[in-house]
């Protein structure tokens, strides 16, 4: 969380951003909030990116003002217009690109003052893994697949019964480049699994950490997966 305070002029206002990550090819949100004003006409929101000459986005007098917008963001940005009046300056970024990573500034002017805060935005690819029993294999085998990751992640297997065990000798992980030549499909196979045990396939890079769990008993198979973004720090 980054909290910035205004400088000079009327009194300063508090602006708060949260470091976040964007999943390339999907829509992302750069989060920014500020002390609300009661009238829309005096609120100005400017998003800037370090190293970029033009603006990322500008909203003033109740409208988008995009005449100074940088070419790389053309047609890809929007504020949540109905939420501006309650202090939400967050920016929706469409079709996140790898090159969108960097330091952004959320700069706010209201009738009460000015303020700004920086935000670190990481970009990459992350997806939920799915763990299945591989019935084609000769021994009891689990297969963990996740369709899109970047940068290349690490894959670690764990088991509820054999806690702390190292499965690197009995697992094999491969990375297959997807058609757009950036993201990769992650496939990890775990051999010699035992019944009545819960196994976890953990995939992690510097942006996200995802886990796929599978519990195999004689009567049923239970699956669960979750994904967590790393380094969501407020500022």
């Amino acid at each position: 969380l980054i909290i910035g305070f205004g400088i000079s002029g009327r009194h300063s206002i508090t602006v708060t951003t949260v470091a976040s990550a964007g999943n390339i090819g999907e829509d992302g949100i750069l989060s920014c909030t500020f002390e609300p004003d009661i009238k829309l006409s005096d609120i100005v929101i400017q998003w800037l990116k370090e190293g970029v000459l033009g603006l990322v986005h500008e909203f003033k007098e109740g409208k988008d003002e995009l005449s100074e917008q940088d070419e790389m963001f053309r047609g890809r940005t929007a504020v949540f217009a109905d939420q501006v009046i309650v202090g939400n300056a967050s920016l929706r970024l469409k079709n996140v690109q790898l090159t969108d990573a960097g330091t952004y500034k959320c700069y706010i002017i209201t009738s009460k003052g000015k303020g700004n805060a920086n935000l670190e935005y990481k970009t990459g690819a992350f997806s939920m893994p799915e763990v299945n029993v591989d019935y084609n294999a000769s021994s009891e085998t689990l297969r963990c697949e996740a369709p899109r990751w970047f940068p290349q992640p690490t894959v670690v297997w764990a088991s509820q019964v054999d806690q702390g065990a190292n499965f690197s000798e009995v697992s094999n992980t491969s990375f297959e480049l997807n058609s757009e030549n950036v993201t990769m499909k992650v496939v990890s196979v775990l051999y010699n699994v035992t019944i009545n045990n819960t196994y976890s396939c953990m995939i992690e890079n510097d942006i996200a950490k995802a886990t796929g769990d599978i519990k195999v008993t004689e009567s049923e198979i239970k699956r669960r997966s979750h994904l967590q973004l790393l380094n969501s720090k407020a500022s």
Partner: antibody, heavy 117, light 107 residues
Framework: QVQLVQSGAEVKKPGASVKVSCKAS????????MHWVKQAPGQGLEWIAA????????DYNQKFKGKAKITAVTSTSTAYMELSSLRSEDTAVYYC??????????WGQGTMVTVSS | EIVMTQSPATLSLSPGERATLTCKAS??????VAWYQQKPGQAPKLLIS???YRYTGVPDRFSGSGSGTDFTLTISSLEPEDFAVYYC?????????FGGGTKVEIK
């Protein structure tokens, strides 16, 4: 859930003052503007003023400057509006209302102030 | 100050009919308009914020549209509980101002 509970009805003599309270709960009182709105009998709605309890910033409708004074006590999450030099035209229902997720999304139940000799 | 003019002042309709309420601002207010419903003895209730965003729990027969100076609240098919007074309000500039209200009454 968000609630705004106002003080009870008041009957006052011309020239007197009255202080209406509005106790907020269910949200962070210091983070959102609190407004006061007047509705005279059979009439429409009229914005009086607003206060931002986080730093006590206020914004008044010029028409009500000198008539209304608004304050907020953050320790009790209560906003107040004092009306001075009361006249018959101040007879009205006064509402407190806040803007949490949308403009004027929560309202108090209203306080009837009657000015009569 | 920005003047909000509502029309008509009264709308006499039967349940099931469509109601169209209009609100005109004396200057451009972008999308900064909200609509409220008020019944006798009650506080106003928010229906539509920022010209077209239906507030949580508001039935989808209520819809708002417009930007700039001309705004509309539409009730697609009136239910008995919809007969009330409706106000528009701008939050583009201070003083915040309301329209004079439109009373929707049973024909």
């Amino acid at each position: 859930q968000v609630q705004l509970v106002q003080s009870g009805a008041e009957v006052k003599k011309p020239g007197a003052s009255v202080k209406v309270s509005c106790k907020a709960s269910g949200y962070t009182f210091t983070s959102y503007w609190m407004h006061w709105v007047k509705q005279a009998p059979g009439q429409g709605l009229e914005w009086i003023a607003a206060i931002y309890p986080g730093n006590s910033d206020t914004d008044y409708n010029q028409k009500f400057k000198g008539k209304a004074k608004i304050t907020a006590v953050t320790s009790t999450s209560t906003a107040y509006m004092e009306l001075s030099s009361l006249r018959s035209e101040d007879t009205a229902v006064y509402y407190c209302t806040t803007t949490v997720a949308h403009y004027f999304d929560y309202w108090g139940q209203g306080t009837m102030v009657t000015v009569s000799s | 100050e920005i003047v909000m003019t509502q029309s008509p002042a009264t709308l006499s309709l039967s349940p099931g009919e469509r109601a169209t309420l209009t609100c005109k601002a004396s200057q451009d207010v972008s999308f900064a308009v909200a609509w409220y419903q008020q019944k006798p003895g009650q506080a106003p209730k928010l229906l539509i914020s920022s010209a077209s965003y239906r507030y949580t729990g508001v039935p989808d027969r209520f819809s708002g549209s417009g930007s700039g100076t001309d705004f509309t609240l539409t009730i697609s098919s009136l239910e008995p509980e919809d007969f009330a007074v409706y106000y528009c309000q701008q939050h583009y500039n201070t003083p915040l101002t309301f329209g004079g209200g439109t009373k929707v009454e049973i024909k």
